[in-house]
């Protein structure tokens, strides 16, 4: 896989629901989680642990006590919560059709390809890592060519995937400017956000960089990048796409 | 939040309260002016319809969350591999109809980057309007508490959660109990500070009771989902 990635009403009546508690120990369906690991089925044992009390509190002005996980038409209860109160909702108009189906069919990256393959979101087909970010679209949706950039570590170091070397490399600060930063942020998914782009000393000990070929003309940023074992500025690009993670001095938190 | 304290203005500016029918149901975290991270179990059917939801940002008290001060939700995207039985992959995104205006009280939290190393027992904070005691009521004010990360291996031990913790989950709290998230905190943030920046490490997911010994809080492991989050943001653009 490539990228690692008004006034509250008083609470009404509620019932105890300890959530999913299997009668017999059995393995759950294998669940695939993102990134590189394949998750093995979690084992369930009859244990004193009341399992899965999600920390959600659902209630309405006129709560209905539900004794079944699903209730008759229109009243839906959140089962598997410690406080399962109902919200009366009209369901008829809420069929989500194709969009939902598409969402459910969407297989997660790495979910069925081997660790070395990358799955196309749109089709579920697997492609070779050497075809990823090589400038040629192999996925029907082109997603193998738009997930070629990431921010790495607590210093937001910009890294670009090299299809030749099948690995991530920091971008050298040489000839970099903020327009490229904006483009990289857009490619990550930050539509209208761009905060700052600066050069920082690379302390990762990287010996391999991606550099800008400024004579490449007005082409896509990734087509301007080439592989280099040297970075004359000795600095790599630190890219912030949004001014995040800043609060009003939380050290004041204690009263 | 059990064992916490009331939050000061601007201390947790990414925290949102997510309402259905004028009632607080879940928490969430601002990651961009348009996108909120929450828990997938908050938006299980029929609450996967965005029309039900209103997000309130920057307001510390539930009593001040009147309809007009909220932001309507345009889109709800639940993780495709979310498992409602096991709570695996318990993460969802909400896209707001109108972008938030950032100020001292409303700001985004940073999504964790690959390559960020978290220490066992790293100091983190949880926040929310959830109950302040097990079986308690939603809190009127935003509360926050310090918790420590608990290694998955330890959390999966037989005397804690007995192999229920997947790599898409992260445990935090104290094995002796006393401090924890609780009902109504779901979807809200588990954050840590590194390099003077606050990072979203987890989204409040589940637990056995609240603040019980050997039953710490379980959170969605946001590090595992950052690529999925960026893909949804990209696809929407």
């Amino acid at each position: 896989m490539a990228l690692n990635s008004g006034s509250p009403p008083a609470i009404g009546p509620y019932y105890e629901n300890h959530g999913y508690q299997p009668e017999n120990p059995y393995p759950a369906q294998p669940t695939v989680v993102p990134t590189v690991y394949e998750v093995h089925p979690a084992q369930y044992y009859p244990s004193p642990v009341p399992q899965y009390a999600p920390r959600v509190l659902t209630q309405a002005s006129n709560p209905v006590v539900c004794t079944q996980p699903k209730s008759p038409s229109g009243t839906v209860c959140t089962s598997k919560t410690k406080k399962a109160l109902c919200i009366t909702l009209t369901l008829g108009t809420f069929l989500v059709g194709a969009a939902l189906a598409a969402g459910l069919l969407w297989k997660f990256m790495g979910s069925k390809c081997s660790n070395s393959g990358i799955e196309c979101d749109s089709s579920g087909t697997c492609i070779n890592p050497s075809n990823w970010c090589d400038g040629v679209s192999h996925c029907p949706g082109g997603e193998d060519e738009n997930r070629c950039v990431r921010l790495y570590g607590p210093n937001f170091i910009l890294q670009v995937y090299s299809s030749q070397r099948k690995s991530w490399h920091p971008v050298c600060q040489d000839d970099w400017n903020e327009n490229y930063g904006r483009a990289a942020c857009r490619d990550m998914g930050y539509k209208n956000n761009f905060y700052s782009s600066q050069g920082i000393v690379d302390d990762s000990g990287s010996t391999s960089f991606m550099k800008l070929n400024t004579s490449a003309g007005n082409v896509d940023i990734y087509k301007k990048l080439y592989h280099s074992d040297a970075c004359s500025s000795k600095a790599v690009v630190s890219l912030r796409c949004i001014a995040c993670g800043v609060n009003l001095n939380s050290s004041r938190q204690s009263r | 939040i059990v064992g916490g304290e009331s939050a000061l203005p601007g201390a947790w500016p990414w925290q949102v309260s997510l309402h259905v029918q004028n009632v607080h149901v879940c928490g969430g975290s601002i990651i961009t002016p348009e996108w909120i991270v929450t828990a997938a179990h908050c938006v299980e059917k029929p609450l996967n319809n965005p029309a039900h939801w209103t997000a309130f940002a920057g307001i510390l008290r539930q009593s001040f969350m009147f309809y007009g001060a909220g932001y309507q939700v345009e889109k709800v995207i639940s993780h495709p591999n979310y498992d409602s039985k096991t709570k695996n992959n318990d993460i969802a995104l909400m896209k707001l109809q109108k972008p938030l205006t950032f100020n001292d009280l409303v700001k985004p939290v940073c999504l964790p980057n690959p390559g960020m190393m978290l220490q066992p027992e790293q100091l983190c904070w949880i926040s929310g309007w959830g109950a302040t005691e097990e079986k308690g009521k939603t809190s009127e004010v935003l509360n926050a508490a310090k918790v420590l990360l608990i290694e998955t291996q330890r959390c999966n031990s037989r005397y804690v959660y007995d192999n229920l913790i997947t790599p898409a989950m992260i445990c935090a709290g104290f094995l002796q109990g006393n401090v924890d998230s609780c009902q109504g905190d779901s979807g809200g943030p588990l954050v840590t500070s590194k390099n003077n920046i606050w990072w979203l490490i987890g989204d409040t997911s589940w637990g056995s009771g609240c603040a019980k010994a050997y039953r710490p809080g379980v959170y969605g492991n946001v590090m595992v989902f950052t690529d999925w989050i960026y893909r949804q943001m990209r696809a929407d653009g």
Epitope: G6, S7 | S6, A7, L8, P9, G10, G58, I59, L60, R61, S63, F64, F66, Y67, G68, A69, G70, Y71, K98, L100, T101, N103, D104, L105, V106, T132, S139, E140, V141, L142
Partner: antibody, heavy 121, light 111 residues
């Protein structure tokens, strides 16, 4: 320093409308809700409504719902209140007041200087 | 809406003596460990000025002779010792919920 500036007086005829302004300075305009309060001569304080500069969606005292309309202009950091169908009952001092909605408190820590509205033919 | 009843409507106190003003709410204005009651002073021709917030916290710059107490539905503002500049009307205000409401006011005069 933090200030809310209001014009001193407005004169209007019965049946007409008047638009009062409140210009904020010295703080982040969108971090506070703006409230409006009425005080008739020799009488107490009456809450009219509030407007969050962020969303611009007001919340009104039922009594003033058809009387007052609250708006904001974020670019000029100014809050406005329009009073319509004026009668002598609307003759009063009108204050804008800042409310730190982000705190747990909900008090008015800064008040405007007040505008005296006189409705007279 | 929560109704706030202030008493007395007016009182006359000698310099250096204690003035006590009461405010009763039609329902509790305390929750989550806070009492959402605040006190203001207003002098003729001036806007109100915040004195006490959350029942008992003194606003910065306000003299320490002003103090507030109470919880639930009953609250008190005390001024001791009363000084000449304290002649004014005093209002209580709650923020337990929207709408916030004010008491009718207590006029403090000096004997």
């Amino acid at each position: 320093q933090v200030q809310l500036q209001q014009p001193g007086a407005e004169l209007a005829k019965p049946g007409a409308s008047v638009k009062l302004s409140c210009k904020a300075s010295g703080y982040t305009f969108t971090s506070y809700w703006m409230h409006w309060v009425k005080q008739r001569p020799g009488q107490g304080l009456e809450w009219i409504g509030l407007i969050p500069p962020n969303s611009g969606s007001s919340n009104y005292n039922e009594k003033f719902k058809s009387k007052a309309t609250l708006t904001v202009d974020k670019s000029s950091r100014t809050a406005y209140m329009q009073l319509s169908s004026l009668t002598s009952e609307d003759s009063a001092v009108y204050y804008c007041a800042r409310w730190d909605y982000g705190s747990s408190y909900g008090y008015f820590d800064v008040w405007g200087t007040g505008t005296t509205v006189t409705v007279s033919s | 809406d929560i109704v706030l009843t202030q008493s007395p409507a007016s009182l006359a106190v000698s310099l250096g003596q204690r003035a006590t003003i009461s405010c009763r709410a039609s329902e509790s204005v305390s929750t989550s460990g806070y009492s959402y009651m605040h006190w203001y002073q207003q002098k003729p021709g001036q806007p109100p000025k915040l004195l006490i917030y959350l029942a008992s916290n003194l606003e910065s710059g306000v003299p320490v002779r002003f103090s507030g107490s109470g919880s639930g539905t009953d609250f008190t503002l005390n001024i001791h010792p009363v000084e000449e500049e304290d002649a004014a009307t005093y209002y209580c205000q709650h923020s337990r919920e929207l709408p916030p409401t004010f008491g009718a006011g207590t006029k403090l005069e000096l004997k």
